[in-house]
């Protein structure tokens, strides 16, 4: 049966009695070898008890003495089998063996849970030589035990290629419960059941769990660890924690907040990032998400003109990146814009409405009745047109852009002329003779350049040809108007 040493027990003597072979307890060792940094493992068995020899792993020496007496089997002496102590306490345990002096270079190594303990442990091996045998005591001490020191420790010795192994010493470090699983924060739907888990371990076991909700115990009598708390549903935020109790006392987990999912708060700080004639780029700062991720957002746009019919345009977009370009708007118009976002629970209220305006638009139609004729005497081309019918939102006409392309054998060049908004005629110098001139005109506002008129072509002859009738914009369906002079 294994003996059990508890921390409350009286300290035991290093040697309860003399070793076999006349070694007395008051003898001082002739040689003491502390293992400082490299070699020897780190734990040592407790008091040596000179009882029956070890029956387990025994080496039978083949050598006999001068008198031809066979040597007894070698084995570690029995020691305490189980040491129970509290965390941060000190412990020392030993294993001992008597080895005939014929053996040289005997070394004891320490092993924990099947792995050799190497490194800077508090391990000391002491040798007590006598006439025939040397008593070897390997001690191991831990100044402040931790849970990680729990385990089974053994001594090993090699003699004659034989391995001698001691009985295990079980070190059980007891302390307050240690949480292996604590409750976690959650966002839950109102009045919907959910589970929280709490698990703590010793030793010592058992560990019992109490649940606490908002500083009140949920269960007045405990549950064995691990414990799952099923909460049938909450209507408001709550904080949960668990207490773990064992024979050493109690510990308390972190408190976790359980939030109730709700509709989000409305977005804030809706702002205009950029405006064009037909689009507005907006951004917003999302409101509180109601403990549930945003799914998407809705941009609501209504004309601010009191004469409008009050209809609302709705544009849906993803919740990220809090940016949206509203398109297909009228130029030079005022709009009210609001943003609403949704999560799994529902839609937020609409943000405060903001006022935004589109800029002027480019003209939507080209100048009409474009005519081109050659004034040979001045070597100019005269161009005339009619002002296009402009809409209010197209903005104020600031002028016209004239494109004239000159093409002759091997030459093609395009020139652009800007003319003011006053009048509806222009004169351009002939650039190339014996060439075709193609003219197009576009109206211009601050909003941009409108569409170009259909091309009108006129042939510019070599010097000395007769000036004929002008070329003009064809009626719809006619072929390209080209006047050959």
């Amino acid at each position: 049966a294994i003996t059990e040493a508890r921390e409350e027990a009286k300290p035991y003597p290093l040697f309860p009695g003399p070793f076999p072979g006349s070694l007395q307890t008051d003898h001082t060792p002739l040689l003491s070898l502390p293992h400082a940094s490299g070699y020897q493992p780190a734990l040592m068995f407790s008091p040596t008890q000179p009882g029956r020899p070890h029956t387990g792993n025994v080496a039978i020496p083949q050598v006999t003495s001068v008198e031809s007496k066979p040597l007894p089997p070698l084995a570690f002496k029995h020691t305490v089998g189980h040491i129970i102590l509290s965390e941060h306490k000190g412990v020392k345990f030993n294993c001992s063996i008597s080895v005939p002096n014929i053996y040289q270079d005997t070394t004891i190594s320490w092993w924990k849970d099947g792995k050799e303990l190497l490194g800077a442990h508090h391990a000391i091996t002491q040798f007590y030589p006598d006439d025939e045998v040397t008593a070897i005591i390997a001690s191991f001490s831990i100044t402040s035990v931790q849970r990680s020191d729990n385990g089974s420790y053994i001594c090993k010795m090699k003699i004659n290629n034989e391995e001698i192994v001691s009985d295990p010493i079980y070190i059980e470090v007891q302390g307050l419960p240690h949480f292996t699983k604590q409750p976690e924060s959650m966002n839950v739907t109102r009045n919907t059941a959910f589970n929280l888990t709490c698990q703590a371990v010793g030793p010592p076991e058992p560990v019992n769990i109490f649940w606490v909700q908002n500083s009140s115990r949920v269960n007045e009598q405990p549950e064995k660890s691990p414990s799952v708390l099923t909460v049938p549903g909450l209507t408001e935020m709550a904080v949960f924690s668990c207490e773990a109790h064992n024979d050493k006392g109690l510990t308390v987990s972190k408190g976790v907040q359980i939030n109730i999912k709700a509709i989000p708060s409305p977005p804030t700080e809706v702002s205009i990032r950029n405006s064009t004639a037909h689009s507005i780029l907006i951004s917003w700062v999302p409101g509180f998400d109601g403990y549930s991720p945003f799914r998407n957002c809705s941009i609501q746009v209504k004309e601010a003109d009191p004469l409008s019919n009050g209809s609302v345009m709705i544009f849906n977009t993803s919740a990220l990146p809090h940016l949206y370009q509203i398109k297909q708007l009228q130029a030079l118009a005022n709009y009210s814009i609001g943003v609403s976002c949704m999560n799994e629970i529902g839609w937020s209220a609409v943000s405060p409405w903001i006022l935004a305006s589109t800029t002027e638009g480019a003209p939507s139609v080209a100048p009409l009745n474009v005519t081109v004729f050659l004034n040979e005497s001045s070597d100019n081309v005269d161009i005339r047109w009619m002002k296009p019918p402009t809409k209010q939102q197209d903005g104020e006409l600031v002028g016209y852009r004239i494109s004239h392309v000159w093409q002759s054998a091997g030459i093609s060049k395009e020139l652009l002329e800007e003319v003011g908004q006053n009048g509806s005629r222009a004169r351009i110098s002939v650039q190339v003779h014996n060439a075709t001139c193609t003219v197009r005109i576009a109206a211009v506002t601050r909003g941009g350049v409108g569409p170009f008129s259909d091309p009108v072509k006129i042939f510019i002859p070599a010097h000395g040809w007769v000036d004929y009738a002008p070329s003009s914009t064809p009626a719809p369906g006619n072929a390209d108007p080209v006047l050959i002079i």
């Epitope: 307050l176 500083s215 009140s216 009598q221 207490e243 109790h245 064992n246 050493k248 308390v252």
Partner: antibody, heavy 121, light 112 residues
Framework: QIQLVQSGPELKKPGETVKISCKAS????????MSWVKQAPGKNLKWMGW????????TYADDFKGRFAFSLETSATTAYLQINNLTNEDSATYFC??????????????WGQGTTLTVSS | DVVMTQTPLTLSVTIGQPASISCKSS???????????LNWLLQRPGQSPKRLMY???KLDSGVPDRFTGSGSGTDFTLKISRVEAEDLGVYYC?????????FGGGTKLEIK
């Protein structure tokens, strides 16, 4: 050695408030709880409830909900029992006892010497 | 609440003689974990209570083995094989299985 030392006897008038202390030594205060037990003259011991010395979470038996409050001064390793709006029925000896839930159930292993409260007009 | 009933109220015993105290509960004290949380306290004259026994029959450290506990369900007994002078005082049983914890009325052990 673990010791629980309670404050001295109290003489109070009905309607007043009393606060009894229980000073712990010899152990880590926050690793256990403290129970309070009432012993009225000629009556049973009556468990009033307990407080977790780490978290301050209290549990009260039904008869002691309302006027009774457990509290802590962790830095002073002291637990308190406060009784408000005292009545004559509160006259009793009040004990504190170290408490937590071990393998044998509620521990109740170390007790204070008791504080005698007399409520009289 | 669980009612704990102790008998007798007073027990007069000669030193060296045995003594027996009964404790009955109004509900079974067998918990769902298989344990029975029935405990005994001793309050010596002028002192605070001291834990004597827990889980029906387990002695607290330092309690002499002349004390034994037995019983199950709702019926429990504390026995002292040979009463000594230091044993006098009031013995209380109490239960920790159900909330709230409740105490018996106490049995006063006096020396004849």
């Amino acid at each position: 050695q673990i010791q629980l030392v309670q404050s001295g006897p109290e003489l109070k008038k009905p309607g007043e408030t009393v606060k009894i202390s229980c000073k712990a030594s010899g152990n880590t205060f926050t690793t256990y709880g403290m129970s309070w037990v009432k012993q009225a003259p000629g009556k049973n011991l009556k468990w009033m409830g307990w407080i977790n010395n780490y978290s301050g979470v209290s549990t009260y038996a039904d008869d002691f909900k309302g006027r009774f409050a457990f509290s802590l001064e962790t830095s002073a390793t002291t637990a308190y029992l406060q009784i408000n709006n005292l009545t004559n029925e509160d006259s009793a000896t009040y004990f504190c006892a170290r408490d937590y839930y071990g393998s044998g159930g509620w521990v109740f292993d170390y007790w204070g010497q008791g504080t005698t409260l007399t409520v009289s007009s | 609440d669980v009612v704990m009933t102790q008998t007798p109220l007073t027990l007069s015993v000669t030193i060296g003689q045995p003594a027996s105290i009964s404790c009955k509960s109004s509900q079974s004290l067998l918990d769902s974990d298989g344990k029975t949380y029935l405990n005994w306290l001793l309050q010596r004259p002028g002192q605070s209570p001291k834990r004597l026994m827990y889980l029906v029959s387990k002695l607290d450290s330092g309690v002499p083995d002349r004390f034994t506990g037995s019983g199950s369900g709702t019926d429990f007994t504390l026995k002292i094989s040979r009463v000594e002078a230091e044993d006098l005082g009031v013995y209380y049983c109490w239960q920790g299985t159900h909330f709230p914890r409740t105490f018996g009325g106490g049995t006063k052990l006096e020396i004849k």
